[in-house]
Interface confidence: low
């Protein structure tokens, strides 16, 4: 390696710096890692400036243009850019990152001592979105509308109600409204609402990183915006999924299978959707929602394409005024474009400045909202499509996916099987359950065009080997090929064992390292119920009595006496609706008293023993902490 005049001392600094930025330890710095570095370093820089610096570093540093910076390239950046502003800012960010790491919180889930800058643009965008979403909700009248130009938002989230409502808008029925404390709030009932919000956010797949109820109560901007973005994004992306929106099949390209389309992430589908309409308009395609949309021209043509044409009953035509395209000034052009978006009811998330600066997060939200309102796609007729392949994910699959995402796996899991086909997510889950992974044996993306699947298969083989030899899982008849090909039954068998071990590990940590198994949990449940003089008990996680949810509800009341309002429950001769009603209340109440429950109400009603086990284990963890 040509090291030029790098001293040994500087070399050491560079290696340390590189290791700090290369957070996934794969030996390369990615665009996201650079972005995260600047976020974590909380330099007093606006979001767009961070973006510019990151893009500049990637452009100048990534010499072989493979989308990542190697250690050699990293040295050249530092050397070649020593005197430039970009390099100075980069160095400052790296030095600051150390400072942040060195300051730890005192509470178990807090970020005490860390300072973070936050995006005014995001605050402005989210406030306007929430105001619109909750404008008619009587429970939010005490805070809505919020002023986007003040700190209203950070005060408004403090009692947990707005967060609970936004979670329910993103994934309906996540939280049972009966469990939200709404009147005469006290510090204790506020704490319950925040528990409910945080644990429910986790259950829908939000990565709730060292963020506790205290942080929300104090309205810490960086954490509040981070959580809200995840909640809003999950809602915006909910229908950008083939099995829930068959018209997306119109985006199939020549020679592509349905399976190929189903593997795309919501972001990739949105980009393809935008380009589909831009092609129809005879315009250039875009490759991102940042630099490529800065001039508003793509947006103009997209609006023109998706605007109602008057051919649908009850939907009047909207003719987009394209004259703003002639504006010389970018900001003016963006403003004219947004005025047209407003005519469609889609002026959301971005200001003209956000468009011109190419704010990737807010532009993504703008496009997603436009898609949800005006997809302008038609399910293709007479196409030779295997509609049977379009089945959506099962509840169990969704639960597993949400669990993984809440742990912060990277990349995010959008499609359970195809996103696990290279086992990278599985390796991260092994680390979460303290099974050491030899990352030198792991092939990392980008995979070569030729032989890429072989690399993925090698990873899958190693993942199965780790499961058998290190984790001591029961993986009889499971091979790497099954993970690689997305064999449902066999992949789920591994994922379940990962989730089970994760759950038991947490229990063992609370219990001072004592081993825990199903019998111990069942005994603890029955003992706790007996001590609290409750009449219910369970014989196993398959006990039919669990379908009423009464053992779960009694256990919650035993852990936190007086928490369950039994007047809301049906206790005898329950029909299916009444069972579901009890179960919804039980799952939300479990989260409200602080248990991070991923299971769904239906899991209780149907007595799904796997998920039932996780519910009781989480409650046991909560009950043991109390002691």
């Amino acid at each position: 390696m040509a090291r030029g005049s790098v001293s040994d001392e500087e070399m050491m600094e560079l290696r340390e710096a590189f290791a700090k930025v290369d957070t996934d330890g794969n030996g390369y710095i990615s665009f996201n890692e650079l972005n995260d570095l600047f976020k974590a370093a909380c330099l007093p820089l606006p979001g767009y400036r961070v973006r510019e610096i990151t893009e500049n570093l990637m452009a100048t540093g990534d010499l072989d243009q493979d989308g990542r910076i190697s250690f050699d390239e990293f040295i050249k950046i530092f050397h070649g850019l020593k005197s430039t502003d970009v390099a100075k800012t980069f160095r400052k960010a790296i030095n600051k990152k150390e400072g942040i790491c060195a300051i730890g919180g005192t509470s178990e889930q807090s970020s005490v001592g860390t300072q973070h800058s936050y995006s005014e643009e995001e605050k402005y965008a989210f406030v306007n979105w929430i105001n619109k979403a909750l404008e008619n909700d009587p429970d939010c009248r005490h805070v809505i509308p919020m002023n986007p130009n003040t700190n209203d938002l950070f005060n408004a989230v403090g009692d947990g109600i707005v967060l609970c409502k936004m979670i329910n808008l993103s994934v309906p029925d996540t939280i049972d409204e009966r469990t939200i404390n709404k009147k005469k709030l006290t510090p204790f009932t506020i704490q319950e609402n925040l528990n409910l919000a945080l644990n429910s956010a986790s259950a829908i797949g939000c990565h709730v990183v060292n963020i506790g109820a205290e942080d929300l109560k104090e309205g810490k901007p960086y954490l509040v915006l981070g959580l809200l973005w995840q909640v809003i994004k999950i809602g915006l992306f909910a229908d950008i999924e083939l099995s829930r929106n068959e018209a997306l099949i119109a985006l199939l390209r020549e020679g592509e299978s349905l399976e190929d389309l189903m593997k795309l992430s919501p972001e990739e589908l949105l980009l393809r959707w935008a380009n589909y309409h831009l092609e129809n308009a005879g315009c250039n395609k875009i490759g991102n929602f940042s630099t490529d949309i800065k001039d508003s021209k793509a947006y103009y043509h997209l609006l023109e394409q998706v605007a109602p044409k008057g051919d649908e009953e009850g939907v009047p035509a909207v003719v987009i005024d394209m004259s703003g395209l002639r504006e010389k000034d970018d900001i003016q052009r963006a403003e004219c474009m947004l005025q047209q978006a407003e005519r469609l009811g889609c002026r959301q998330f971005v200001t003209a400045t956000d468009v011109v600066r190419g704010n990737p997060k807010l532009n993504l939200a703008f496009i997603a909202n436009l898609f949800n309102r005006y997809p302008a796609l038609h399910k293709p007729e007479n196409q030779d499509i295997d509609w049977g392949a379009l089945e959506g994910e099962t509840r169990e699959e969704r639960t597993f996916r949400n669990w993984m995402n809440s742990l912060g796996v990277n990349p995010r899991v959008n499609h359970l099987y195809s996103d696990l086909s290279d086992a990278l997510v599985i390796f991260q889950l092994y680390e979460k359950i303290k099974v050491p992974v030899d990352w030198n044996r792991v092939n990392k993306p980008p995979y070569p065009k030729l032989g890429g699947n072989m690399k993925k298969l090698e990873n899958c083989n190693y993942a199965v080997e780790l499961g058998k030899n290190q984790a001591k899982f029961s993986l009889v008849g499971i091979g790497g090929q099954d993970l690689n090909e997305g064999n449902r039954t066999l992949t789920l068998a591994l994922i379940w064992q990962l989730m089970r071990r994760y759950t038991l590990n947490i229990l063992e940590e609370i219990g001072g390292g004592q081993k825990v198994n199903d019998d111990i949990i069942v005994n603890w449940v029955n003992e706790t119920l007996r001590e609290a003089k409750k009449s219910s008990s369970i014989s196993s996680f398959k006990d039919p009595k669990i379908s009423t949810s009464l053992p779960v509800l009694d256990l919650i009341d035993a852990i936190q006496p007086g928490s369950i309002n039994y007047d809301l429950l049906k206790t005898e001769n329950l029909n299916d609706d009444e069972k579901l009603n009890n179960a919804k209340y039980a799952i939300s109440m479990a989260r409200k008293i602080g248990a991070r429950v991923y299971a769904l109400p239906e899991d209780l009603v149907e007595v799904n023993p796997k998920m039932v086990m996780t519910v009781f284990a989480c409650l046991m963890g909560k009950g043991m902490k109390r002691v």
Epitope: A19, K20, D22, T23, D24, G25, N26, G27, E98, C101, A102, I103, G104, G105, E108, Q109, S111, G113, T114, H207, V208, V209, N210, L407, G408, E431, K432, K434, V437, D438, W439, N440, V442, I506
Partner: nanobody
Framework: QVQLQESGGGLVQPGGSLRLSCAAS????????MGWYRQAPGKQREMVAI???????YYGDFVKGRFTASRDDAKNTWNLEMTNLKPEDTAVYYC???????????????WGQGTQVTVSR
């Protein structure tokens, strides 16, 4: 309170080998980047090896293939296998790690007290 404790230092002849270990104690969930550093009398502290959380390892230029760093995250212990030692390797060797005490918690910047390694006839 998290603590790191090095062990395995001592007196060794040139060309000999030593195995340093570092054990973390206290409430630990996981360790991110960990490293070995050394400081010779009158000199600045220098990096010996860094193991990033993904397992990617970096070595100081003077190592030249003589040392091997490894980590056992299940036991929260880290080792530095040193072979073909030279008199200029004489120094106090320190263990360092960024440690999380809870799942997804903040990273604590943690140093050990150091262990003396002397390479001499």
């Amino acid at each position: 309170q998290v603590q790191l404790q090095e062990s395995g230092g001592g007196l060794v002849q040139p060309g000999g080998s030593l195995r340093l270990s570092c054990a973390a104690s206290g409430s630990i969930f996981s360790a991110s980047t960990m490293g070995w550093y050394r400081q010779a009398p009158g000199k600045q502290r220098e990096m010996v090896a860094i193991i990033a959380s993904g397992g990617f390892t970096y070595y100081g230029d003077f190592v030249k293939g003589r040392f091997t760093a490894s980590r056992d995250d299940a036991k929260n212990t880290w080792n530095l296998e040193m072979t073909n030692l030279k008199p200029e390797d004489t120094a106090v060797y320190y263990c360092h790690a960024f440690i999380r005490t809870v799942v997804d918690g903040p990273l604590y910047n943690t140093w050990g007290q150091g262990t003396q390694v002397t390479v001499s006839r």
